[in-house]
């Protein structure tokens, strides 16, 4: 089955520093997202070979890419305290597959000793609950039908 290998599991960095997140797959995907998990998951980037990457405005000018969509390294620069969170790679394939997540802890330099990563992967509670296998349910579900657009929006 298709899988996404993601590294590192966790990283602690001071404000202003950079972090690399690598997403690797066995190929056969349409493109790949890096998403920040939370009550409302948020796309950070979408990368597809041969297409200009799309980046969330919060990170524009702070993200570099290297490699290809099958083996992509995303570098996030000039990290801020508000960038702390769990980031997961999501491959667009016939069955949605997700990486295990990277917990990024951005700290004030003087307080680095208080917040350190363990060797364990991010806590399961920070990620969508996986069923068997590597395919996960949609972490951003639409619980209700959208309202029909105003009549003026109709063709």
């Amino acid at each position: 089955a298709q899988e996404v290998q993601q590294s590192p599991h966790c990283t602690t960095v001071p404000v202003g520093a950079s972090v690399n997140i690598t997403c690797s797959t066995s190929g056969g995907l349409r493109g790949i997202y890096l998403r920040q998990l939370g009550p409302q998951p948020q796309d950070i980037i979408y990368y597809e070979d041969g297409v200009v990457p799309t980046t969330d405005r919060r990170f524009r000018g702070r993200i570099d890419f290297s490699g290809s969509q099958d083996n992509l390294t995303i570098t996030m620069h000039r990290l801020q305290l508000s960038d702390t969170g769990t980031y997961t790679c999501q491959a667009i394939t016939e069955v949605n597959v997700y990486g295990s997540g990277t917990l990024v802890l951005v700290t004030e330099e003087q307080s680095q000793g208080w917040h350190r990563c363990s060797d364990a992967p991010p806590r399961a509670s920070a990620l969508p609950a996986p069923p068997t296998g590597s395919a996960l349910p949609d972490p951003q579900t639409a619980s209700a039908l959208p309202d029909p657009p105003a009549a003026s929006a109709l063709p």
């Epitope: 998403r35 796309d43 979408y46 799309t54 667009i92 951003q140 639409a142 959208p146």
Partner: nanobody, 122 residues
């Protein structure tokens, strides 16, 4: 440019089946929730079914529950509507609609297709 092209409509007898397709191009399909709407002559356009951007959630208008199934293929950039046990009251023009939800890089963007006619009649 952005396009949503519906196909698969036609004339079918009551109790029959049709499968509608909507092929998307010109935008990042996986960033958008996809919906099917329909409009019968002299009536307002109504929402039939919606599927979330990664396919994890789908919802249906009450009158089609158990008969219609929405699905999507994010590799082929296509959304489908499988319609079974069709009734005369399902007769309408069926439209494809794309809407980028909160959390999407394209939040708020939305696009319509031109529609495909479905006629259920004996």
């Amino acid at each position: 440019q952005v396009q949503l092209v519906e196909s698969g409509g036609g004339l079918v007898q009551p109790g029959g089946s049709l499968r509608l397709s909507c092929a998307a191009s010109g935008f990042t399909f996986s960033g958008f929730d996809m919906s099917w709407y329909r409009q019968a002559p002299g009536k307002e356009r109504e929402l039939v079914a919606t599927i979330s951007r990664f396919g994890g959630s789908s919802n249906y208008e009450d009158s089609v529950k158990g008969r219609f199934t929405i699905s999507r293929d994010n590799v082929k950039d296509t959304v489908y509507l499988q319609m079974n046990s069709l009734k005369p009251e399902d007769t309408a023009v069926y439209y494809c609609y794309a809407l980028a939800p909160a959390g999407s890089l394209w939040h708020g963007d939305n696009y319509w297709g031109q529609g495909t006619q479905v006629t259920v009649s004996s």
